[in-house]
Protein backbone atom coordinates (compact mmCIF):
# COMPACT_ATOMS: atom_id res chain seq x y z
CA UNK A 1 0.00 0.00 0.00
CA UNK A 2 2.81 2.38 0.96
CA UNK A 3 4.63 1.68 -2.31
CA UNK A 4 1.46 2.20 -4.35
CA UNK A 5 0.81 5.49 -2.63
CA UNK A 6 4.36 6.73 -3.25
CA UNK A 7 4.07 5.84 -6.92
CA UNK A 8 0.84 7.82 -7.14
CA UNK A 9 2.23 10.75 -5.16
CA UNK A 10 2.80 13.55 -7.68
CA UNK A 11 5.38 15.08 -5.35
CA UNK A 12 7.77 12.17 -5.97
CA UNK A 13 8.21 13.49 -9.53
CA UNK A 14 9.55 16.86 -8.35
CA UNK A 15 13.32 16.95 -8.98
CA UNK A 16 16.02 18.58 -6.90
CA UNK A 17 15.85 22.34 -7.27
CA UNK A 18 12.05 22.32 -7.00
CA UNK A 19 9.42 21.78 -4.31
CA UNK A 20 5.97 20.27 -4.37
CA UNK A 21 3.67 23.28 -4.08
CA UNK A 22 0.55 22.38 -2.07
CA UNK A 23 -0.93 25.77 -2.87
CA UNK A 24 -0.86 25.01 -6.59
CA UNK A 25 -2.28 21.47 -6.75
CA UNK A 26 1.06 19.90 -5.95
CA UNK A 27 2.77 21.30 -9.04
CA UNK A 28 6.57 21.26 -8.97
CA UNK A 29 7.65 24.85 -8.47
CA UNK A 30 11.24 26.10 -8.68
CA UNK A 31 12.87 26.97 -5.39
CA UNK A 32 12.57 30.71 -4.73
CA UNK A 33 15.74 32.84 -4.72
CA UNK A 34 18.12 32.12 -1.82
CA UNK A 35 16.69 28.65 -1.24
CA UNK A 36 17.48 25.14 -2.47
CA UNK A 37 16.39 21.52 -2.43
CA UNK A 38 19.14 18.96 -2.81
CA UNK A 39 16.85 15.95 -3.27
CA UNK A 40 13.67 15.24 -5.20
CA UNK A 41 10.19 15.04 -3.72
CA UNK A 42 10.68 17.90 -1.28
CA UNK A 43 7.62 19.78 -0.04
CA UNK A 44 9.69 22.84 0.88
CA UNK A 45 13.00 24.36 -0.11
CA UNK A 46 15.64 25.07 2.52
CA UNK A 47 16.96 28.57 3.07
CA UNK A 48 20.51 29.04 1.74
CA UNK A 49 23.26 29.50 4.27
CA UNK A 50 24.63 33.05 4.23
CA UNK A 51 28.35 33.55 4.77
CA UNK A 52 28.55 36.80 6.70
CA UNK A 53 30.98 38.51 9.00
CA UNK A 54 34.06 36.37 9.60
CA UNK A 55 32.67 33.75 7.19
CA UNK A 56 33.21 34.12 3.46
CA UNK A 57 31.58 32.29 0.59
CA UNK A 58 33.56 29.33 -0.71
CA UNK A 59 30.73 28.06 -2.94
CA UNK A 60 27.62 29.99 -3.93
CA UNK A 61 24.19 28.59 -3.17
CA UNK A 62 22.38 27.07 -6.15
CA UNK A 63 18.86 25.75 -6.54
CA UNK A 64 20.16 22.24 -5.76
CA UNK A 65 22.92 22.81 -3.20
CA UNK A 66 23.56 24.94 -0.16
CA UNK A 67 26.24 27.61 0.01
CA UNK A 68 29.56 26.60 1.59
CA UNK A 69 31.53 28.95 3.79
CA UNK A 70 35.11 29.19 4.90
CA UNK A 71 36.81 31.79 7.07
CA UNK A 72 38.37 35.13 6.23
CA UNK A 73 42.18 35.37 6.40
CA UNK A 74 43.43 35.23 9.99
CA UNK A 75 40.79 32.67 10.96
CA UNK A 76 40.32 28.93 10.35
CA UNK A 77 37.29 26.64 10.24
CA UNK A 78 36.07 24.53 13.13
CA UNK A 79 33.22 22.06 13.26
CA UNK A 80 31.33 20.17 10.58
CA UNK A 81 30.85 22.23 7.42
CA UNK A 82 32.86 25.10 8.93
CA UNK A 83 30.20 25.94 11.51
CA UNK A 84 32.62 28.22 13.41
CA UNK A 85 35.65 30.36 12.66
CA UNK A 86 38.49 30.50 15.17
CA UNK A 87 41.26 33.06 15.24
CA UNK A 88 44.67 31.99 13.89
CA UNK A 89 47.74 32.39 16.04
CA UNK A 90 51.37 32.40 14.92
CA UNK A 91 53.43 29.24 14.92
CA UNK A 92 54.86 28.91 18.42
CA UNK A 93 51.61 30.09 19.98
CA UNK A 94 48.25 28.73 21.09
CA UNK A 95 44.86 30.36 21.43
CA UNK A 96 43.68 30.92 25.01
CA UNK A 97 40.72 32.79 26.49
CA UNK A 98 43.01 35.81 26.68
CA UNK A 99 44.14 35.54 23.05
CA UNK A 100 47.26 34.11 21.46
CA UNK A 101 49.98 33.16 23.95
CA UNK A 102 53.51 31.87 23.31
CA UNK A 103 54.14 28.19 23.95
CA UNK A 104 55.69 27.53 27.34
CA UNK A 105 59.28 26.29 27.41
CA UNK A 106 59.36 22.61 26.52
CA UNK A 107 56.34 22.80 24.24
CA UNK A 108 55.84 23.71 20.58
CA UNK A 109 53.19 24.36 17.96
CA UNK A 110 54.19 24.18 14.30
CA UNK A 111 50.77 25.32 13.03
CA UNK A 112 48.60 28.43 13.21
CA UNK A 113 45.89 26.49 15.05
CA UNK A 114 45.75 23.95 17.84
CA UNK A 115 47.57 23.75 21.14
CA UNK A 116 51.21 23.67 22.18
CA UNK A 117 52.48 20.10 22.57
CA UNK A 118 55.42 18.85 24.63
CA UNK A 119 58.73 18.23 22.92
CA UNK A 120 59.43 14.57 22.25
CA UNK A 121 61.45 12.85 24.97
CA UNK A 122 64.00 11.15 22.74
CA UNK A 123 65.52 9.14 25.58
CA UNK A 124 62.30 7.17 26.05
CA UNK A 125 63.09 5.47 22.73
CA UNK A 126 66.80 5.18 23.43
CA UNK A 127 67.53 8.05 21.06
CA UNK A 128 69.44 11.27 21.59
CA UNK A 129 68.55 14.86 20.74
CA UNK A 130 70.14 15.98 17.47
CA UNK A 131 68.47 19.39 17.30
CA UNK A 132 66.93 21.22 20.23
CA UNK A 133 63.27 22.12 20.14
CA UNK A 134 61.87 25.61 19.82
CA UNK A 135 58.43 27.14 20.33
CA UNK A 136 57.75 26.44 16.65
CA UNK A 137 59.41 23.03 16.21
CA UNK A 138 59.80 19.76 18.04
CA UNK A 139 63.22 18.44 18.94
CA UNK A 140 64.82 16.16 16.37
CA UNK A 141 65.71 12.77 17.74
CA UNK A 142 68.66 10.96 16.24
CA UNK A 143 68.71 7.30 15.23
CA UNK A 144 69.07 4.72 17.96
CA UNK A 145 72.70 3.79 18.78
CA UNK A 146 72.20 0.37 17.17
CA UNK A 147 71.57 2.11 13.85
CA UNK A 148 74.94 3.86 14.06
CA UNK A 149 77.25 0.98 14.94
CA UNK A 150 79.68 -0.43 12.35
CA UNK A 151 77.95 -2.98 10.17
CA UNK A 152 74.50 -1.54 10.78
CA UNK A 153 72.35 -2.31 7.78
CA UNK A 154 71.36 0.56 5.51
CA UNK A 155 68.34 -1.37 4.34
CA UNK A 156 65.08 0.06 5.62
CA UNK A 157 63.18 -2.68 7.48
CA UNK A 158 59.93 -3.65 5.80
CA UNK A 159 56.90 -1.91 7.23
CA UNK A 160 54.80 -4.18 9.44
CA UNK A 161 51.79 -5.75 7.77
CA UNK A 162 48.67 -3.67 8.28
CA UNK A 163 45.11 -4.76 8.66
CA UNK A 164 42.82 -3.87 5.77
CA UNK A 165 41.37 -0.40 6.12
CA UNK A 166 44.30 0.98 8.10
CA UNK A 167 46.22 3.68 6.30
CA UNK A 168 49.98 4.00 6.77
CA UNK A 169 51.27 6.75 9.04
Amino acid sequence: FERTRSLQDPCSNCPAGTFCDNNRNQICSPCPPNSFSSAGGQRTCDICRQCKGVFRTRKECSSTSNAECDCTPGFHCLGAGCSMCEQDCKQGQELTKKGCKDCCFGTFNDQKRGICRPWTNCSLDGKSVLVNGTKERDVVCGPSPADLSPGASSVTPPAPAREPGHSPQ
Partner: nanobody
Protein backbone atom coordinates in the same frame (compact mmCIF):
# COMPACT_ATOMS: atom_id res chain seq x y z
CA UNK B 1 57.99 4.58 5.88
CA UNK B 2 59.51 6.19 2.80
CA UNK B 3 61.97 4.40 0.56
CA UNK B 4 65.12 6.45 -0.06
CA UNK B 5 67.41 6.18 -3.08
CA UNK B 6 70.76 8.00 -3.24
CA UNK B 7 72.69 8.99 -6.35
CA UNK B 8 75.68 11.12 -7.30
CA UNK B 9 78.50 9.26 -5.61
CA UNK B 10 81.76 8.46 -7.34
CA UNK B 11 85.52 8.93 -7.49
CA UNK B 12 86.86 12.48 -7.30
CA UNK B 13 90.23 14.08 -6.71
CA UNK B 14 90.99 16.00 -3.54
CA UNK B 15 89.74 19.55 -3.82
CA UNK B 16 86.96 18.46 -6.19
CA UNK B 17 83.19 18.59 -5.81
CA UNK B 18 80.24 16.19 -5.87
CA UNK B 19 76.51 16.63 -5.45
CA UNK B 20 74.63 13.79 -3.80
CA UNK B 21 70.89 13.50 -4.23
CA UNK B 22 68.35 11.53 -2.24
CA UNK B 23 64.94 10.78 -3.76
CA UNK B 24 62.11 9.73 -1.46
CA UNK B 25 59.20 7.51 -2.53
CA UNK B 26 56.69 9.63 -0.60
CA UNK B 27 56.28 12.96 1.14
CA UNK B 28 59.24 14.06 3.27
CA UNK B 29 57.41 17.03 4.78
CA UNK B 30 56.05 15.16 7.79
CA UNK B 31 59.49 13.94 8.88
CA UNK B 32 61.19 15.80 11.72
CA UNK B 33 64.36 16.03 9.65
CA UNK B 34 66.13 14.66 6.60
CA UNK B 35 69.81 13.87 7.00
CA UNK B 36 72.96 12.57 5.38
CA UNK B 37 75.14 10.17 7.34
CA UNK B 38 78.43 8.61 6.32
CA UNK B 39 80.31 5.51 7.34
CA UNK B 40 83.93 4.75 6.61
CA UNK B 41 85.08 1.10 6.81
CA UNK B 42 85.21 -0.10 10.41
CA UNK B 43 83.96 3.20 11.77
CA UNK B 44 80.66 4.23 13.30
CA UNK B 45 78.08 5.88 11.09
CA UNK B 46 78.26 9.65 11.71
CA UNK B 47 75.97 12.55 11.01
CA UNK B 48 77.19 14.75 8.15
CA UNK B 49 74.31 17.20 7.80
CA UNK B 50 70.61 17.48 8.51
CA UNK B 51 67.79 19.81 7.59
CA UNK B 52 64.52 20.12 9.50
CA UNK B 53 61.05 20.77 8.05
CA UNK B 54 61.50 24.50 8.74
CA UNK B 55 64.92 24.39 7.04
CA UNK B 56 67.06 24.64 10.14
CA UNK B 57 70.39 23.01 9.28
CA UNK B 58 73.08 21.29 11.30
CA UNK B 59 76.51 20.17 10.10
CA UNK B 60 79.33 18.05 11.47
CA UNK B 61 82.26 20.29 12.43
CA UNK B 62 84.47 18.53 9.90
CA UNK B 63 82.29 19.59 6.93
CA UNK B 64 81.17 23.09 7.98
CA UNK B 65 81.77 25.62 5.23
CA UNK B 66 82.37 22.89 2.63
CA UNK B 67 79.09 20.96 2.51
CA UNK B 68 75.58 22.36 2.01
CA UNK B 69 72.35 20.43 2.56
CA UNK B 70 69.10 21.46 0.86
CA UNK B 71 65.63 20.02 0.38
CA UNK B 72 62.79 20.32 -2.09
CA UNK B 73 59.50 19.26 -0.52
CA UNK B 74 57.66 19.47 -3.86
CA UNK B 75 60.05 16.95 -5.46
CA UNK B 76 60.68 15.03 -2.21
CA UNK B 77 64.43 15.27 -2.64
CA UNK B 78 67.35 16.13 -0.35
CA UNK B 79 70.70 17.16 -1.82
CA UNK B 80 74.17 17.40 -0.36
CA UNK B 81 76.55 19.72 -2.18
CA UNK B 82 80.13 18.73 -1.30
CA UNK B 83 83.02 21.08 -2.14
CA UNK B 84 86.74 21.08 -1.34
CA UNK B 85 86.61 17.33 -0.80
CA UNK B 86 89.35 15.67 1.25
CA UNK B 87 90.55 12.06 1.35
CA UNK B 88 89.05 11.76 4.84
CA UNK B 89 85.61 12.39 3.32
CA UNK B 90 85.83 8.95 1.69
CA UNK B 91 82.89 6.87 2.94
CA UNK B 92 79.52 5.42 2.08
CA UNK B 93 77.02 8.30 2.28
CA UNK B 94 73.50 7.36 3.31
CA UNK B 95 70.32 9.42 3.28
CA UNK B 96 68.07 9.16 6.35
CA UNK B 97 64.52 10.23 7.17
CA UNK B 98 64.26 11.01 10.88
CA UNK B 99 60.89 10.63 12.55
CA UNK B 100 60.78 11.01 16.32
CA UNK B 101 57.95 8.52 16.70
CA UNK B 102 59.39 5.73 14.55
CA UNK B 103 62.55 3.99 13.44
CA UNK B 104 64.85 5.90 11.13
CA UNK B 105 64.40 5.14 7.44
CA UNK B 106 67.69 4.62 5.61
CA UNK B 107 68.68 4.51 1.96
CA UNK B 108 71.10 1.93 0.58
CA UNK B 109 74.00 4.38 0.43
CA UNK B 110 76.30 5.70 -2.28
CA UNK B 111 80.09 5.40 -2.29
CA UNK B 112 82.20 8.56 -2.31
CA UNK B 113 85.93 8.10 -2.82
CA UNK B 114 88.33 11.05 -2.67
CA UNK B 115 91.80 10.32 -4.01
CA UNK B 116 94.86 12.33 -3.06
Amino acid sequence: QVQLVESGGGLVQAGGSLRLSCAASGSIFSYNAMAWYRQAPGKQRELVALITSDRTTKYADSVKGRFTISRDDTKNTVDLEMNSLKPEDTAVYTCAALLNSARTSWGQGTQVTVSS
